[in-house]
């Protein structure tokens, strides 16, 4: 049966793609796998292949994939086999926009919001869980309130801020009893006031490749908080930046390629090159963050010709401290993130 | 597991359209092509065309050039294929397709059974 | 276009008997090639795909085997379970079936 494009169709005339990938096209039954799984580098998932028999390491972001090799499905990854048409048998693989997220075992939409707790608002993008604070740490003006402390308050989610005057007899903070700080309470006064609040960037979602950071802002026609997301690096995953710590340091703070690249993002290409720093690592237990960055506006440009553009967060500089917490634990940076947002907005 | 789950069966008049939808589950529906193939009654397998649900490119055989349309909503995980001009010898079993290696483990739909009859 | 033609079109065999289907491609198809079954009734299933890979399930007693323009089937003992409808495919270029070979029960 000959082919006849329809209208809409470019020429899909198939051509063979050679497999460069050194592991197994194809499944065999019954399985042989190694007598050990291998050990993948850092960020790489160890995984069971296609074949359902062993584990390998998973494909990642523009390697070739096929049903035995299969694309990193943490890195919400799949196997764009369009370019093999119609022998689907060797794909590369490429990110979807707008992959769900699993958090704690629900699956949440793409671009779905939701509280999976009292005290935080997350949003599900791209595959990554950003999340923000509800209750907001504004602290009170030193000027009338010198020694503040948050206090827990049975039925309230929210710790609020206390003073402590001088006669250490503990009283609210906001005068004319103004909520509190808690987050209703600011939300309305917000509302009545129109004061403008945009909340710092929320930690990245991810220590390595691709995720996503979030941050509420009211500072719009209607007044009201809304959550704004960027996508996020902190550092590649493929790259061993341990290796690059001088002799006698403990710690890399910035690592910046020495080529330009061009960003990709579920199999488009950013319009334009850059040459990013990322934050680099330590030989002991500090982790290294950004402390200097801003959000910049990235173009991209798909092969079916469509375009749109991602904010995305630029880093000049990072600091490494001792304030880690569980890498797996998305809720732990927001506890104790440093408010930078004077210099990193 | 994967799924395609098509549509009931139609009894349509000589030179009416039929639509049939295939609903896809346990995949992602954009990441793969849907094709579609025929079985008129008492025959072989008879291929009609694909579509990439991803971005709605379309590619049709071309026998059926100018009288199948093949679309999709991926809200809901759903494509169509639409026969216009229909004739009796359109009749037949119409099966969706998962594109994936000679489908294997892909699962073809259970089929629509298409009656044309005046 | 790439014409597929199968033989026989019917084979009848008893249940313990080696059955041996051929495809033709009228063009090299290289090793695009997949077998299916089909029950009445049912949807078409694949057995092999890529001319000799057995697909995930399928028992041991079917293979395939052939590259380029000749192709065969080989189910090494017939169980009850395989008296169907047998039909190859390639998909080198799109997809083209062949006839279809019926087995049935001798």
């Known amino acids: 049966t000959a082919l006849s494009p329809a209208p809409t169709t470019m020429d899909f005339t198939p051509a063979p793609l050679e497999d460069t990938s050194s592991r197994p096209q194809f499944c065999k039954w019954p399985c042989e796998c190694p007598p050990s799984p291998p050990r993948c580098p850092l960020g790489v998932s160890l995984i069971t292949d296609g074949c359902e028999c062993c584990k390998m390491c998973a494909q990642q972001l523009g390697d070739n994939c096929t049903e035995a090799a299969i694309c990193d499905p943490h890195r919400g990854l799949y196997c764009d086999y369009s370019g093999d048409r119609p022998r689907y048998a060797i794909g590369v693989c490429a990110q979807v926009v707008g992959v769900g997220c699993v958090l704690d075992g629900v699956r949440y939409n793409n671009g779905q919001s939701f509280q999976p707790n009292c005290k935080y608002n997350c949003t599900c993008i791209d595959g990554a869980v950003g999340c923000t604070p509800l209750c907001l740490r504004v602290r009170p003006p030193r000027l009338w309130c010198p020694h503040p402390r948050r206090v827990s308050i049975p039925g309230h989610c929210c710790e609020q801020w206390v003073c402590e005057d001088d006669a250490k007899r503990p009283r609210k903070t906001a005068p004319r009893d103004t909520g509190a700080f808690d987050a209703v309470g600011e939300v309305e006064a917000w509302h009545r006031n129109c004061i403008a609040y945009t909340s710092p960037w929320s930690p990245c979602s991810t220590s390595c490749g691709l995720g996503v950071s979030t941050r509420i802002s009211n500072v719009n026609a209607q007044c009201w908080p809304e959550q704004e997301s960027r996508l996020c690096n902190l550092r590649p995953c493929d790259v061993d930046i341990h290796t690059l710590i001088k002799a006698g340091k403990k710690c890399l703070a910035v690592y910046q390629p020495e080529a330009s690249m061009n960003f990709t993002l579920a199999g488009c290409i950013s319009t334009r090159s850059y040459q990013p720093k990322y934050c680099g690592v330590c030989m002991d237990n500090r982790c290294c963050i950004p402390y200097k960055s801003k959000t910049i506006d990235v173009s991209f440009q798909c092969p079916d010709g469509l375009g749109f553009s991602r904010q995305v967060l630029w880093i000049n500089a990072c600091f490494c401290n001792l304030s880690c917490r569980n890498p797996n634990d998305i809720f732990a940076d927001l506890e104790s993130y440093p408010d930078f947002s004077e210099i990193a907005n | 597991q994967v799924q395609l789950v098509q549509s009931g069966a139609e009894v349509q008049k000589p030179g009416a359209s039929v639509k049939v939808s295939c609903k896809a589950s346990?995949?992602?529906?954009?990441?793969?092509?849907i094709h579609w193939v025929r079985q008129a009654t008492g025959q072989g397998l008879e291929w009609m065309g694909w579509m990439d649900p991803n971005n709605g490119k379309t590619g049709y055989a071309q026998k059926f050039q100018g009288r199948v349309t093949m679309t999709r909503d991926t809200s809901i995980s759903t494509a169509y294929m639409e026969l216009s001009s229909l004739r009796s010898e359109d009749t037949g079993v119409y099966y969706c397709?998962?594109?994936?290696?000679?489908?294997?483990?892909?699962?073809w739909g259970q089929g629509t059974l298409v009656t044309v009859s005046s | 276009d790439v014409v597929m033609t199968q033989s026989p079109s019917t084979l009848s065999a008893s249940v313990g008997d080696r059955a041996t289907i051929t495809c033709r491609a009228s063009q090299s198809v290289d090793t695009w090639l997949a077998w299916y079954q089909q029950k009445p009734g049912k949807a078409p299933h694949v057995l092999i795909y890529k001319a000799s890979n057995l697909n995930s399930g399928v028992p041991s007693r079917f293979s395939g085997s052939g590259s380029g323009t000749e192709f065969t089937l080989t189910i090494s003992s017939l169980q009850p379970d395989d008296f169907a409808t047998y039909y190859c495919q390639q998909y080198k270029t799109w997809w083209t079936f062949g006839q279809g070979t019926k087995v049935e029960i001798k």
């Open positions: 346990g995949y992602r529906f954009i990441n793969n092509d």
């Open positions: 397709v998962r594109g994936i290696i000679a489908a294997a483990g892909g699962g």
